[in-house]
Interface confidence: medium
């Protein structure tokens, strides 16, 4: 009976996500058969989050809207380990919007999910950010420094990275 009600709950939860994510890839968390964590197929997973590389070229605002339609946000990078995971799925000749912007052009950077901006956990390329009229952040590859962040104009179409919390069922 307990197993039956658990299954019913899982099915109703899966139905919630079906609209945006017709297919989920789930893995068993730990040793308990009851706990599964899922990411939409073909998103990738790292720790408690799912990631999607959007290859369509759009402005920052449109990229964020595109992520939000999928129940996600443009990516917020919290650690070096997280960035190291993300870059494994990126192409060196492309740039990708992050969920980081400076709307007022006063170098008050802010993350889309209101995570406090911490100067100590940023990965700007050397000399960046350097253009006051460029108020959105991308991650890109520079041969001298590998992967890092750069400020660019928010209207310039780029690829993007979406991030959402894992779905637990």
């Amino acid at each position: 009976n307990f197993m039956y009600s658990k299954t019913v709950k899982r099915l109703s939860k899966l139905r919630e996500y079906q609209q945006y994510h017709p297919s989920l890839t789930c893995v068993m968390e730990g040793k308990d058969i009851e706990d599964w964590s899922c990411c939409p197929t073909p998103w990738t997973s790292f720790q408690s989050s799912c990631y999607f590389i959007s290859t369509g070229m759009q402005s920052w605002t449109k990229s964020q809207k595109n992520c939000s339609v999928m129940g996600a946000d443009l990516v917020v990078i919290n650690t070096r380990e997280e960035q190291d995971f993300i870059i494994q799925n990126l192409k060196r000749n492309s740039s990708y919007f992050l969920g980081l912007s400076d709307p007022g052009g006063r170098r008050h950077w802010q993350w889309v999910d209101q995570t406090p901006y911490n100067e100590n956990v940023t990965f700007w390329h050397s000399g960046e950010p350097n253009n006051l009229d460029e108020r959105c952040a991308i991650i890109n590859f520079r041969s001298s420094e590998e992967w890092g962040w750069n400020d660019i104009h928010c209207h310039v179409p780029q690829k993007s990275i979406c991030k959402m919390k894992k779905i637990y069922i």
Epitope: G127, H153, H155
Partner: antibody
């Protein structure tokens, strides 16, 4: 007084190259994004290239991508446009133009030079 | 690319009357509540001069007889009362989508 002065235009054969310059004065060049915009003989205006204030970001329309390169020397207050593999459709008056100093308004040019004429003959 | 269609291609207006120029975009030029549509004036032998940015903001030094309105895809430049020195070609430009594009121009003649 804000001034932008273009030079380097002229007559060039199809497939040839040309380097345009734009010397600026009257404002802090290194703080402003600059674009090249051209005007065809039919008076049609077409954006050609953009370079960020720091010189690290450059953008081009498909019509010139791979053929034109925009660059700047902030120490010399000078903007450049290197044009190669020139075609007859590149014949135009080329203007350098300063962007409005508002990040919210993209590609809005508030001051323009007098232009330099480029003619590509076949 | 966003196509901007200006109309009329040319118009003649009597001194002191109103000149109205229309600019229609092939898709919305709204970006986060800002209308990224701008107006320029160009006189023969001169470069374009910015008159109005973001649909309705008058650039500094431009006389108040110039005004802009509109949103989404339909925009208008009004000049009232028209003066002799307003004889020129007027262009609209959008900056919402890369690449930025310009309208074909409207030539204003003063009668």
């Amino acid at each position: 007084e804000v001034k932008l002065v273009e030079s380097g235009g002229g007559l060039v054969k199809s497939g040839g190259s040309l380097k345009l310059s734009c010397e600026v004065s009257g404002f802090t060049f290194s703080s402003y994004t600059i674009s090249w915009v051209r005007q065809t003989p039919e008076k049609r205006l077409e954006w050609v290239a953009y370079i960020s204030s720091g010189g690290d970001n450059a953008y081009y329309p498909d019509s010139v991508k791979g053929r034109f390169t925009i660059s700047r020397d902030n120490a010399r207050n000078t903007l450049y446009l290197q044009m190669s593999s020139l075609r007859s459709e590149d014949t135009a008056m080329y203007y350098c133009a300063r962007h409005l100093y508002y990040g919210d308004y993209f590609y809005v040019m508030d001051y323009w030079g007098q232009g330099t004429s480029v003619t590509v003959s076949s | 690319d966003i196509v901007l269609t200006q109309s009329p291609a040319s118009l003649a207006v009597s001194l002191g009357q109103r000149a109205t120029i229309s600019c229609k975009a092939s898709q919305s030029v709204d970006y986060d509540g800002d209308n990224c549509l701008h107006w320029f004036q160009q006189k023969p032998g001169q470069p374009p001069k910015l008159l109005i940015y973001a649909a309705s903001n008058l650039e500094s030094g431009i006389p108040a007889r110039f005004s802009g309105s509109g949103s989404g895809t339909d925009f208008t430049l009004n000049i009232h009362p028209v003066e002799e020195e307003d004889a020129a070609t007027y262009y609209c430009q959008q900056s919402n989508e890369d690449p930025p594009t310009f309208g074909g121009g409207t030539k204003l003649e003063i009668k």
